[in-house]
Every structure is written in C-alpha cells, then in structure tokens.
C-alpha cells in the first residue's frame, strides 16, 4: 500500500511574533527516503525544513524524529513574521540520486495576523 502524507489542518492562523505548529503524519516510513517541508509549489517552492539536517534556525521538529518508528513529522515555526504566510506542504521522498518526490500532504495555509 502506498504511503500517505496526512496534514490534518487545511489552515492555521498565528499572530506575528508567536509560534505555530504544522502537523504532518505518515502512514508508513517505506519506501525509505527523506521527509521535507516546503512553502509553495512548483519550481519556486521554498525549503522550510528537512529532517536530514539541522540548520533551520526558526523551525524545529515537534516529536523525536530520530525514533526509528517515528511517523510524526510535524514542525514548529517560531517568531512568525508576515513573510511566513503561505501554504506549507509536508513531502515524502523516495531515496535516489536525486531523491524522488512520491507523496505530498494536502497543504496547510498559514495566515499571519497583525499583533
């Protein structure tokens, strides 16, 4: 059965300066390959977080993604700014050179409210 990427919230609202959690769960870790979060779609989409590296200052994983059975790939964005508004996608890749996108969540739109 094909892996499914579940983003339960269609949208979230957050006040500027606050934090927000974007939820994402997978139904399987197979096939092996990385999970990444993007804002937007297509060629211009922006990488927001990758579970393969740890160089994303304002974004952290919510659960312990180093658990070998972990299926929760939710992220927390801190100190949200108006520039963070947009639709965020949790994307599962299959390993390869390069990795191949095989499944994306439905997206969660982030609205940033003035404080």
């Amino acid at each position: 059965t094909e892996v499914k990427v579940i983003q339960p919230e269609k949208s979230v609202s957050v006040a500027a300066g606050d934090s927000t959690v974007l939820n994402c769960t997978l139904t399987s870790l197979l096939p092996v390959g990385p999970i990444r979060w993007y804002r937007g779609v297509g060629q211009s989409r922006q990488l927001i977080y990758s579970f393969t590296t740890e160089h994303f200052p304002r974004v952290t994983n919510v659960s312990d993604a180093t658990k070998r059975s972990n299926l929760d790939f939710s992220i927390r964005i801190s100190n949200v700014t108006p520039e963070d508004a947009g639709t965020y996608y949790c994307v599962k890749f299959q390993r390869g050179s390069p990795d191949t996108e095989i499944q994306s969540g439905g997206g969660t739109e982030v609205y940033v409210l003035a404080k």
Epitope: V32, T52, D64
Partner: antibody, heavy 118, light 107 residues
Framework: DVQLVESGGGVVRPGESLRLSCAAS????????MSWVRQAPGKGLEWLAG????????YYIDSVKGRFTISRDNSKNSLYLQMNSLTAEDTAVYYC???????????WGLGTLVTVSS | ALTQPASVSANPGETVKITCSGG??????YGWYQQKSPGSAPVTVI????KRPSDIPSRFSGSASGSAATLTITGVRVEDEAVYYC???????????FGAGTTLTVL
C-alpha cells in the same frame, strides 16, 4: 570537532556485569540518535543497539536482547551500555557511534576493550 | 545478510569497486566504513548510499540500486589499504547489519 570517548572496559568473569560509557562533545548530543557497535577479535563489525535522541526508543540485535541495555543522559552528554550475564563471546572492542538521520553512522569513538575470561 | 567480497586488490591509480548485496531498495539505506587495522576506530567514508563526509577525499564515492550498493575508489592510493565494511539500515525491521568486510590491498 565531534568527539566520542568510550570508557568502562576491562576484564570480567563469565556471568558478571559491566557498564560502558561514551562521553560526547563537539555537537548537540540531545539531537542525535546513538548506537553501540562491537568487534570481536579477528571478526567484523557487529551492531548491537541504538537509541533515539530523546532516549525513549531503543532497538537491539536479537543476540543481546534481554542482557544488554542502552541508555543515555542528555544532561551529561553521555551514552551507556549496561551488559549483564557476560560470556566469552562478548569479548570485543566496543564502539559508540553517532547516527545519521537514517540510522547509519557518521562518527565513531576509539573503542574500549571488554574481555570476558575465567 | 549483506554480502561483500572477502578481498580485492588494485595497483595505485586504478579504480576499485566493492559491492554489497542483500539489501532491499525499498527499505535499506547503505553506508561504508574504513578500518585500517583490527580494533582501530572505523572511519565513515560514505553514508546514506552516496553521501561523503566533508573530510573524506573525493576519490571515494558511493551508489545504490536494486538490492546492492557499490563503493568506488577512483585513483586508489597506498594509504587506502584497509578493510571496508558495508552496513545497511533496514527501515522495515529497524535493525542495522554489517557485511563481513572486504580487504583492499594496493599492490
């Protein structure tokens, strides 16, 4: 620089216990899963156990399940391996290793020798 | 179990390929580890199929396809003499496995 330093090895009798430690420095220890790997004299590498970054999940090879326990103390940047009911077959150099995101290894300690002999 | 040749040999400057088979493309990631003498600390030369740590020379490369992984050393040097172990992480069983090791001799 990433550094892993094992300690606690030595000579013990069959049936006895030993606790190995691995002191980590040069990286955010609490962000990484860790593993123990051993090498018996004249043999190859053998993975024994791995533990998640937060310490709540542990995994073992069948041959040590129930006898060995992997644990960690993130406040002390330390990894441990409690070994009980040791036998001569457990004689080996024991290495701690830092795991990559997909549970392979990127950094290794120098190892500590455990000898089980009567 | 992961299977690799017991030994390979090459002249300096030649290209060496060491294969590791027995994994499953769907569930297994591979790594390669160099050990220059028994009991000395292994050194990671490749992880995640093809990722080379920054301090490893570019002559080392890795690839994976189907049920096998390959370590390639392009322009092998005398200092590359060592035992090379492949390892796999199986995302189905959550277990790591090592191959028996391949002794590389540079003639």
């Amino acid at each position: 620089d990433v550094q892993l330093v094992e300690s606690g090895g030595g000579v013990v009798r069959p049936g006895e216990s030993l606790r190995l430690s691995c002191a980590a420095s040069g990286f955010t220890f609490s962000s990484y899963a860790m593993s123990w790997v051993r090498q018996a004299p004249g043999k190859g590498l053998e993975w024994l156990a791995g533990i998640s970054a937060g310490g709540s999940d542990a995994y073992y090879i069948d041959s040590v399940k129930g006898r060995f326990t992997i644990s960690r103390d993130n406040s002390k940047n330390s990894l441990y391996l409690q070994m009980n009911s040791l036998t001569a077959e457990d004689t080996a150099v024991y290495y701690c290793a830092r795991e990559t995101w997909n549970h392979l290894f990127d950094y290794w300690g120098l190892g500590t020798l455990v000898t089980v002999s009567s | 179990a992961l299977t690799q040749p017991a030994s390979v040999s090459a002249n300096p400057g030649e290209t060496v390929k060491i294969t590791c088979s027995g994994g499953d493309w769907y569930s297994t990631y591979y790594g390669w580890y160099q050990q220059k003498s028994p009991g000395s600390a292994p050194v990671t030369v490749i992880h995640s199929d093809d990722k080379r740590p920054s301090d490893i020379p570019s002559r080392f490369s890795g690839s994976a396809s189907g049920s096998a992984a390959t370590l390639t050393i392009t322009g092998v040097r005398v200092e590359d003499e060592a035992v090379y172990y492949c390892a796999g992480y199986d995302g189905r069983t959550y277990i790591n496995t090592f191959g028996a090791g391949t002794t590389l001799t540079v003639l």
